[in-house]
């Protein structure tokens, strides 16, 4: 079973992270898939884009996404200088000028178009379940994950340790 | 300061166990996966296991699957590693090392100074 | 399972000489590559985290590069406490350590 602890210990770390730098620390990009192995793909209709989750035909070529990461302070519960150690913080970027959002009031992922600095919106805390197994926790919402409904990304609340284990908020990251 | 502090190494037969203890400080544990690496003497670095922070996943090596467990007690800032049916070829210094990033997996960075393990009749 | 091959095994070089290391994996780890110093006797130490980020209180002659299967680290001018025993690792697919370059001052 995979886990991700302690949602309620860091909300209030989360609130008071600050991104170290200005620039990601690393850069690359990765195909996004589900734990159930379905493509997340991006569509342009209608002048803005669509984010699907779908089993994609044998030949047809996935979606890549740019992945930013960040290094983010947090808050100290046991350290002498103020904070404990690093976070690292992601942003999703799958065209230029286009950051995955979270839409904490509808509950949704969308994509948006914007110039940097990127608001708290599009910065999302990343957990590994192991190295190809990630989370991505909303910055602005601390306990609220990207997940999957219904073929498509929304943001799920995840408020005990037993819902940490589902496995619609992870994702895998390859290169293929 | 981050301290990590290992107990438990020493001289044991082959077949034997020995169950290694890690004590950290200086950082909120429970938000940081946690590994063993082991060194043999004159030799290089092997990554031997790793553990989440909430210690629902483990992984291992696979010469040491089914011989060695990893487990924490974030109560008591502690980790383990249960070595079963040891081998002269476990014989090394047996590093306990923390996760560089909170809840990830990605990079490490505060190791210990290693507690020596010795398999031989 | 990646492997992880660094080249050489044993680097001699001069105080002052701009020093690179190697290292080389089986498939593409995407910048997911840390650099370690280890002097004799004592554990290991982070130098070079994401491939190219100096950890805190890290001389700035040391750097990192590299992307896809090909990574380096470079010291710019060999200092006498530079000499020990240097380790790349891959965090992007498990976790595999190279095994070692040894500096040595000529």
């Known amino acids: 079973a995979f886990g991700i602890s302690g949602v309620q210990k860091y909300t209030r770390a989360l609130h008071d992270s600050s991104i170290t730098g200005i620039s990601p620390i690393t850069e690359y990009l990765a195909s996004l898939s589900t734990y159930n192995d379905q493509s997340i793909t991006f569509a342009l209709e209608d002048e803005s884009y669509e984010i699907y989750v779908e089993d994609l035909k044998k030949d047809e070529k996935k979606d890549k996404v740019l992945l930013s990461y960040y290094e983010s302070q947090h808050p100290s519960n046991e350290s002498g200088d103020g904070v404990d150690g690093k976070m690292l913080m992601v942003t999703l970027s799958p065209t230029k000028d286009f950051w995955l959002h979270a839409n904490n009031k509808e509950h949704s992922v969308e994509l948006h178009k914007c110039e940097k600095p990127l608001p708290d919106q599009a910065f999302f805390v990343l957990h590994n379940m192991h190295s190809n197994c990630v989370s991505f926790e909303c910055k602005t919402d601390p306990g609220v994950f990207i997940g999957v409904k219904d073929n498509h990304l929304a943001l799920i609340k995840v408020d005990s340790s037993e819902n940490l284990c589902t496995e619609n908020i992870l994702f895998k990251l390859s290169e293929t | 300061e981050v301290q990590l502090v290992e107990t438990g190494g020493g001289l044991v037969q082959p077949g034997r166990s020995l169950k290694l203890s890690c004590v950290a400080s200086?950082?909120?544990?429970?938000?940081?996966?946690m590994y063993w690496i082991r060194q043999a003497p004159g030799m290089g670095l092997e990554w031997v296991s790793s553990i989440n922070n909430d210690g629902g996943n483990t992984y291992y090596l696979d010469s040491v699957k089914g011989r060695f467990t990893i487990s924490r007690n974030n109560a008591e800032n502690t980790v383990y590693l249960q070595m079963n049916s040891l081998r002269s070829e476990d014989t090394a210094t047996y590093y306990c090392v923390k996760g560089h990033y909170s809840y990830s997996s990605y990079s490490i960075d505060y190791w210990g100074q290693g507690t020596l393990v010795t398999v031989s009749s | 399972d990646i492997q992880m091959t660094q080249s050489p095994s044993v680097l001699s070089a001069s105080v002052g000489d701009r020093v690179t290391l190697s290292c080389k994996a089986s498939h593409n780890i995407n910048k997911h590559l840390d650099w370690y110093q280890q002097k004799v006797g004592e554990a290991p130490k982070l130098l070079i985290y994401?491939?190219?980020n100096l950890q805190t209180g890290i001389p700035s002659r040391f750097s990192g590069s590299g992307s896809g299967t090909d990574y380096t680290l470079t010291i710019s001018s060999l200092q006498p406490e530079d000499v020990a025993t240097y380790f790349c690792?891959?965090?992007?697919?498990?976790?595999?350590f190279g095994q070692g370059t040894k500096v040595e001052i000529k």
């Open positions: 994401f491939t190219n």
């Open positions: 200086g950082f909120t544990f429970s938000n940081y996966w």
């Open positions: 690792f891959q965090y992007n697919s498990g976790w595999t």
